[in-house]
Amino acid sequence: QQQTLPKPFIWAEPHFMVPKEKQVTICCQGNYGAVEYQLHFEGSLFAVDRPKPPERINKVQFYIPDMNSRMAGQYSCIYRVGELWSEPSNLLDLVVTEMYDTPTLSVHPGPEVISGEKVTFYCRLDTATSMFLLLKEGRSSHVQRGYGKVQAEFPLGPVTTAHRGTYRCFGSYNNHAWSFPSEPVKLLVTGDIENTSLAPEDPTFPADTWGTYLLTTETGLQKDHALWDHTAQNLLR
């Protein structure tokens, strides 16, 4: 006999990276018929929602109107059908950004390179932080973590056209409080390659929104940044 229900999906709209004082909605999608959803923050009960009518609703939203550092952290949700509770969702790391200062991002040898050339990004921030994050806009949304007193190095190694795209970096004051984003740096990778198969270029998101897209899961289409979020959050953990 089944003792728990399948875990729900959790994600943030419009994004898990939320500028301070901006709004964010945490979405939890379970099953039709769920009579109660609980949102947990840092292991403690944070909010409860009871959808009406439960048989027609399989998703609830928890609205945060004014993001700040106290609201940043790890969220999870569970739901109940009758007396039976679900497994907890994966953890959602909600990050507050635009804290304190703005880092500077540069790339060596330059923003335009040849396929196969070794490329290194440098993220510099003079305020007190020792962790830096480099993010590439795009579907695969690679996130790298680096360390340094005022500057971190992010070696990409020999690049291919798959590395083309727009990059930004953040200074991280803790896992869930990040600086303003750096100005974007667009990396162009040119070069004719003989007998080399290269990965296709990543689609890139509009720089102002960091994008939205659809992710196919076993339960259908999940809107927004679930894959993107999980990539970054696995790194955070």
Epitope: S106, P111, E112, I114, S115, K118, D192
Partner: antibody, heavy 116, light 107 residues
Framework: EVQLQQSGPELVKPGASVKISCKTS????????MHWVKQSHGKSLEWIGG????????SYNQKFKGKATLTVDKSSSTAYMELRSLTSEDSAVYYC?????????WGQGTTLTVSS | DIVMTQSPATLSVTPGDRVSLSCRAS??????LHWYQQKSHESPRLLIK???QSISGIPSRFSGSGSGSDFTLSINSVEPEDVGVYYC?????????FGAGTKLELK
Amino acid sequence: EVQLQQSGPELVKPGASVKISCKTSGYTFTEYTMHWVKQSHGKSLEWIGGISPNIGGTSYNQKFKGKATLTVDKSSSTAYMELRSLTSEDSAVYYCARRGGSFDYWGQGTTLTVSS
Amino acid sequence: DIVMTQSPATLSVTPGDRVSLSCRASQSISDYLHWYQQKSHESPRLLIKYASQSISGIPSRFSGSGSGSDFTLSINSVEPEDVGVYYCQNGHSFPLTFGAGTKLELK
């Protein structure tokens, strides 16, 4: 010590081709792209193109596409530039230069004279 | 293509002078600007990278400044061996381009 040793001066006839070499030592050849720069007599520097030795990726100045072909031989850590259909306009000193961000090391230059 | 414009074309100096060489890019290149010195019958030599970063083995009298589209190479006390042509180079976008050069000569 990083060194880029270029082949000697060339005197060739119009319409011919020539292949200039740049033998490197003192660093890992595949870790830096190699570039070629033209300097006509009394003139400034012109970037011809560059090549990444590890996978052979190339980028050319549009002006030199069809004129120059860049290749490498990883086994001997040598870069090559072939120039074809030569005319008097191609008479110049040609340099190879390693791109370590900037062009941090240069060959001594190869003088090419195209004359009948 | 990014056009690099250097001025003056020629600079006549006296040893001990402090001199400034100018380089202007036709569009912003951030700090992806490099300076080279070329003495007569020699290969170019890197002096300053990324607008202001010094190079090991280059005398400290050479310094660079600027960002965006306007850059300056300064020599704070010219020595006779500094005679030659100085080139700036766009390291931002392909095709990589050089300025026409500033010729430094002694009076």
